[in-house]
Amino acid sequence: KRFHDVLGNERPSAYMREHNQLNGWSSDENDWNEKLYPVWKRGDMRWKNSWKGGRVQAVLTSDSPALVGSNITFAVNLIFPRCQKEDANGNIVYEKNCRNEAGLSADPYVYNWTAWSEDSDGENGTGQSHHNVFPDGKPFPHHPGWRRWNFIYVFHTLGQYFQKLGRCSVRVSVNTANVTLGPQLMEVTVYRRHGRAYVPIAQVKDVYVVTDQIPVFVTMFQKNDRNSSDETFLKDLPIMFDVLIHDPSHFLNYSTINYKWSFGDNTGLFVSTNHTVNHTYVLNGTFSLNLTVKAAAPGPCPPPPPPPRPSKPTPSLGPAGDNPLELSRIPDENCQINRYGHFQATITIVEGILEVNIIQMTDVLMPVPWPESSLIDFVVTCQGSIPTEVCTIISDPTCEITQNTVCSPVDVDEMCLLTVRRTFNGSGTYCVNLTLGDDTSLALTSTLISVPDRDPASPLRMAN
């Protein structure tokens, strides 16, 4: 059998086989050693017994989408049946004090590969045995600790495969310079050691995407905005836009990146090299935000211009275009190509509470001579829309340990002046966070307050 017979039905065209060579990967036309690495179809009864105590699940993830030319990293994590884990030696053991359906196990090992390898290796003097090989016959790499690696991962995409020896978690990075744009399929088959052979334990596949568009995401933040994810913001307060470029392999690290903004409010285009920008909308309404990101990225070099054609055909030159050097690329050429990314959002601008201030605090005199608690009035002003709710969070002087939170509806006139009355149990210094809210905004002010002992002579004061 060949690798493509074993690893999947997605057979790429001959064009892909010829043009999309991945560095360090091999053609899936190669032969697969079925004696060492048996192949089971989906639904084969042998899968049930491929792992002691249940089925192993393989989870394949990637940091897709990848900008063409960058590296994409795939990670496979094995999830063992309940109560099983891999130990420092690569053996699979039962977790202590963990009960599964079979109860507590007397044998600490699910698979004791250390013991197997010590008494089962008929090796030659080089430390290499005929079974320490990958499915295509290549020997396992002998880096330190390789004996503790008991899983064989075979990655397959674009008509090529990559083999890796590993533990319960492996990562593989692929350069996408030669990968066709669009969605592609990565398939992974995982085998475990089994004496002098291997047993399949899991198969998994995942779609990844290679794109020529820079993957761009914009986060938006505005002080007093109640819900930053609803794309509704407040008039007359700056919004901070922060551009996040998805570039996990740092492909664009040395690129100059330009950001071209259109905020949709007739303020024109704004061009910047900074990934953050502030913008204030001064009118209510719905606006279309557009961002274009431009980066000069490493890319393929254009073919050189064809040589000038002679006026008369010259027999000694041979047919035009037959020269194999004409379209080849010089290997150490360092070419740049402009890549673009786009982001568009519709944002709604509404009235909101712009500011809140405590302008006065008063100790409310109680009718009782020595009450156990103090009533404090906070006189508060605000700017912007009419608040509908007031919340006070009373904490310790560091403002970290909350003692009491009270929220209640509030009736405020157009002047936006209100008095909030709160109870303080006992004297001392308190941190008071006071927020005024409406449907779209939440404005905060804080103060430290010193509540005196209940001696009528001691005044209330702001501690800061």
Epitope: T388, T419, T423, D439
Partner: antibody
Framework: EVQLLESGGGLVQPGGSLRLSCAAS????????MSWVRQAPGKGLEWVSS????????YYADSVKGRFTISRDNSKNTLYLQMNSLRAEDTAVYYC?????????WGQGTLVTVSS | QSVLTQPPSASGTPGQRVTISCSGS????????VSWYQQLPGTAPKLLIY???QRPSGVPDRFSGSKSGTSASLAISGLRSEDEADYYC???????????FGGGTKLTVLG
């Protein structure tokens, strides 16, 4: 002069629906939160629901949650209470009141009777 | 069972001073303003006291409100026959997210 005038009350069978209205005048309706309070015959006052000036925030008593819906039309200076799945215990005079942290003006009320 | 507790009845003779109590908890009276409402027989309620002790314009200064901890009280001095009515205390409850009333106190003016 602030005036609140309720309408829409009447006799309805259990499980039925009714929509109360409250026409407001004498103040800038869109600047104020509004509320509904009810009083069963011979009993005390029970708060039913409140709505913010813009209509974006709404509160309901547990006894009516999921059955009653408060709403307002600021262009018409009108407050509404849509009452569905009515029960015998919803029988009461329903008052419309201005504000929600305190009720500074009240209407004269409209009687809702739920009976088969 | 009301969240705020009031005595069901109170009485006094004309000219006397009468106090009606209202007790609650830190989530209502303790940290929110208390209001008092007067309901004359056969009429809609009317706001008498707001923000614990403030009187709306038109309410005589014979009516006064006060609060201490989780209790509030309404005092009526110089009692008159026209004060005969039901009196309710009310406050927002921040735990219940609801406005709560006391069960009401029926004030009778004797004589």
């Amino acid at each position: 002069e602030v005036q609140l005038l309720e309408s829409g009350g009447g006799l309805v069978q259990p499980g039925g629906s009714l929509r109360l209205s409250c026409a407001a005048s004498g103040f800038t309706f869109s600047n104020y939160a509004m509320s509904w309070v009810r009083q069963a015959p011979g009993k005390g006052l029970e708060w039913v629901s409140s709505i913010s000036h813009s209509g974006g925030s709404k509160y309901y008593a547990d006894s009516v949650k999921g059955r009653f819906t408060i709403s307002r039309d600021n262009s018409k200076n009108t407050l509404y209470l849509q009452m569905n799945s009515l029960r015998a215990e919803d029988t009461a005079v329903y008052y419309c009141a201005r504000k929600w942290s305190t009720f500074d003006y009240w209407g004269q009320g409209t009687l809702v009777t739920v009976s088969s | 069972q009301s969240v705020l507790t009031q005595p069901p009845s109170a009485s006094g003779t004309p000219g006397q001073r009468v106090t009606i109590s209202c007790s609650g908890s830190s989530s209502n009276i303790g940290n929110n303003y208390v209001s008092w409402y007067q309901q004359l027989p056969g009429t809609a309620p009317k706001l008498l006291i707001y923000a614990d002790s403030q009187r709306p314009s038109g309410v005589p200064d014979r009516f006064s409100g006060s609060k201490s901890g989780t209790s509030a009280s309404l005092a009526i001095s110089g009692l008159r026959s026209e004060d005969e009515a039901d009196y309710y205390c009310g406050a927002w409850d921040s735990s219940l997210n609801a406005y709560v009333f006391g069960g009401g106190t029926k004030l009778t003016v004797l004589g």
